[in-house]
């Protein structure tokens, strides 16, 4: 029997300080640019080396950004989302959703030598 792929979804508040070259990441998504089918959310598509986000270390490519400085990113056009980040000020608070892939082993099978408990 094949293993099952599950996802562990967690949320985190990330506070970034805008660096000399900005926040240092790219986004995709929006109501006019759906990156994930049936989801117009905003996703991180790229973290730039040595940028503020990379140096902080918590934001990851593939994360969904739920809000910026408390402002919800639901139902926004792509460019409106971009503008929201660009006008977010020096200290930027991001509410993000991490989606971690968890590979479960074959169901009902125990490898040789596994504890039987």
């Amino acid at each position: 029997m094949n293993g099952r792929v599950d996802y562990l979804v967690t949320e985190e508040e990330i506070n970034l300080t805008r660096g000399p070259s900005g926040l240092g990441f790219n986004i995709v998504g929006g109501t006019d640019q759906q990156y994930v089918s049936n989801d117009s959310g905003i996703y991180v598509s790229r973290i730039k080396e040595n940028g503020a986000a990379a140096l902080d270390g918590r934001l990851q490519e593939g994360d969904k950004i739920l809000s910026v400085n408390g402002q919800d990113l639901k139902n926004l056009l792509h460019q409106d989302a971009v503008d929201l980040f660009r006008n977010a000020g020096y200290a930027v608070s991001l509410r993000v959703q991490h989606r971690l892939q968890v590979q479960n082993g074959p169901i009902g099978h125990r490898g040789e030598g596994d504890p039987s408990g």
Partner: nanobody
């Protein structure tokens, strides 16, 4: 991995026109931020033009003469070059970044782009 293939370069007389094309692989082409750069012999690579989801930008040296555009259905970006001058002679490269930068005015920096084409030679005599 995104593959980029440029075409359309060639030899043209001053005052003439060329249209460069850059075709990219990948199902999410519409989310790409794209740019054209050029490099003349013995010079650094320089920004020419950029197109994002909703904006276009140009180097001052090509404003009014060059037009950048894209066709998302064909996974292709174009650079229409009119009124060409000898100083436009260079190898022209297309470049792609995945998504839109959340930081302003970063499009001139080659480090902003993730993938590059092999280049196409434009010679204006």
């Amino acid at each position: 991995e995104v593959q980029l293939v440029e075409s359309g370069g060639g030899l043209v007389q001053a005052g003439g026109s060329l249209r460069l094309s850059c075709t990219a692989s990948g199902r999410t082409f519409s989310t790409y931020t794209m740019g054209w750069f050029r490099q003349a012999p013995g010079k650094e690579r320089e920004f020419v033009a950029h197109i994002s989801w909703s904006s276009t930008y140009y180097a001052d040296s090509v404003k009014g003469r060059f037009t950048i555009s894209r066709d998302n259905a064909k996974n292709t970006m174009y650079l229409q070059m009119n009124s060409l001058k000898p100083e436009d002679t260079a190898v022209y490269y297309c470049a792609v970044a995945i998504g839109s930068p959340v930081d302003s005015y970063r499009h001139r920096d080659p480090l902003e782009y993730d993938y590059w084409g092999q280049g196409t030679q434009v010679t204006v005599s």
